[in-house]
């Protein structure tokens, strides 16, 4: 008799989810000599112990602590870039500019960028079907949880001056319910960070305005300020020519405002 | 914040040679390029030469084959080699450094090129 099989809302785990886990750790341990000690089948293990046979509903930040653990990794505090709608970008930047980096230069964001994952309460089974939708299902869901947890950690270990990339092109430039929003920005410690700079990226080619005076920018202002921290913003017209000069800054067209 | 201090700058006759270096301090996170730019009066300020962290270089035209620039990563230091001086090379001679999108400059050393 087929066991009756819940329905969720999202899509269902990404499929050759362990192998692609797997292999990204092989992959970021080859590349990544400071974590060349780590063993990579332990860390699949943790990864699976987070979320297999529990319900899909109920995941807490206590069930990836193993994982978290084993993934232990020392990044410069002071040369992070976080980011918000703008993922693609945010990558391409730190690919050039080697020494700042995104969550997902790290090993546990590396290893879970872009896939979805879940179990099955009392399974041990892999439910590449569907997975619980954060809105529609819960938000105590295997893949909310983990970006919650490693990005809590993340904005924790920042320190002196913090950049997050911004998506100018989206009403809200700031977004209180996004990953930065509601989990980064309230886990920055005033105690070592000293400015959290915006970079407000335009969608634009001929957008000249200053979006650093968007009200949502304001408010993010509002709430840094209120936990002592210093803000400061800065505009990117040309994400294009931005990038460009970060590739070939020593073009002369690269010193005057991008 | 960072700073530029640029030394080697001075007098010297028609022919001859000066080197310019220009060292940066303060809150760094990489270096992409430095270089150095030139504003005579009542002209605009020009490229000279600038290079970055790799090693990539860009000259002016009028430097060209005259003019060598060169960098010290370690010391956050970059250089400007200037032979062959010409009259038309005076001009007061600014540091740069580009990390996108910051641009700093330094405050900038008298070059005289006498006839």
């Known amino acids: 008799v087929p066991r009756w099989r819940q329905q969720w809302s999202g899509p269902g785990t990404t499929k050759r989810f362990p192998e692609t886990v797997l292999a990204r750790c092989v992959k970021y341990t080859e590349i990544h000599p400071e974590m060349r000690h780590v063993d990579c089948q332990s860390v699949w293990d943790a990864f699976k112990g987070a979320f297999i046979s529990k319900h899909p509903c109920n995941i807490t930040e206590e069930d990836y602590q193993p994982l978290m653990k084993l993934g232990t990794q020392t990044v410069p505090c002071n040369k992070i870039l976080l980011w918000s709608r703008i993922k693609d970008l945010a990558h391409q930047f730190t690919q050039v500019q080697r020494d700042m980096f995104t969550l997902e230069d790290t090993l546990l964001g590396y290893l879970a960028d872009d896939l979805t994952w879940c179990g099955e309460f009392n399974t041990s089974k892999i439910n590449y079907q569907s997975c619980p939708d954060w809105r529609k299902d819960c938000s105590n869901n295997p893949v909310s949880v983990f970006w919650k947890t490693v990005s809590r950690r993340f904005a924790e270990a920042a320190c002196d001056v913090v950049h997050v990339m911004l998506n100018g092109s989206r009403s809200k430039i700031f977004d209180k319910n996004s990953t930065f929003g509601s989990v980064e920005v309230h886990n920055l410690q005033p105690e070592k960070v000293q400015t959290l700079e915006a970079w407000v990226i335009h969608g634009g080619r001929e957008d000249s305005r200053d979006l650093c005076q968007d009200p949502t920018i304001k408010e993010l202002e509002s709430i840094i300020s209120k936990r002592n921290i210093q803000f400061s913003c800065k505009n990117i017209y040309r994400p294009d020519k931005f990038l460009q000069c970060v590739k070939n800054p020593e073009d002369s067209s690269c010193t005057s405002e991008i | 914040q960072v700073q530029l201090v640029e030394s080697g700058g001075g007098l010297v006759q028609a022919g001859g040679s000066l080197r310019l270096s220009c060292a940066a301090s303060?809150?760094?996170?990489?270096?992409?390029?430095m270089g150095w730019y030139r504003q005579a009066p009542g002209k605009q300020r020009e490229l000279v030469a600038a290079?970055?962290?790799?090693?990539?270089?860009n000259y002016g035209d009028s430097v060209k084959g005259r003019f060598t620039i060169s960098r010290d990563n370690a010391k956050n230091t970059v250089y400007l080699q200037m032979n062959s001086l010409k009259p038309e090379d005076t001009a007061v001679y600014y540091c740069?450094?580009?990390?996108?999108?910051?641009?700093?400059w330094g405050q900038g050393t008298q070059v005289t090129v006498s006839s």
């Open positions: 290079i970055s962290t790799a090693g990539s270089t």
């Open positions: 740069n450094l580009n990390f996108p999108p910051y641009v700093y």
């Open positions: 303060g809150r760094i996170f990489s270096i992409n390029a």
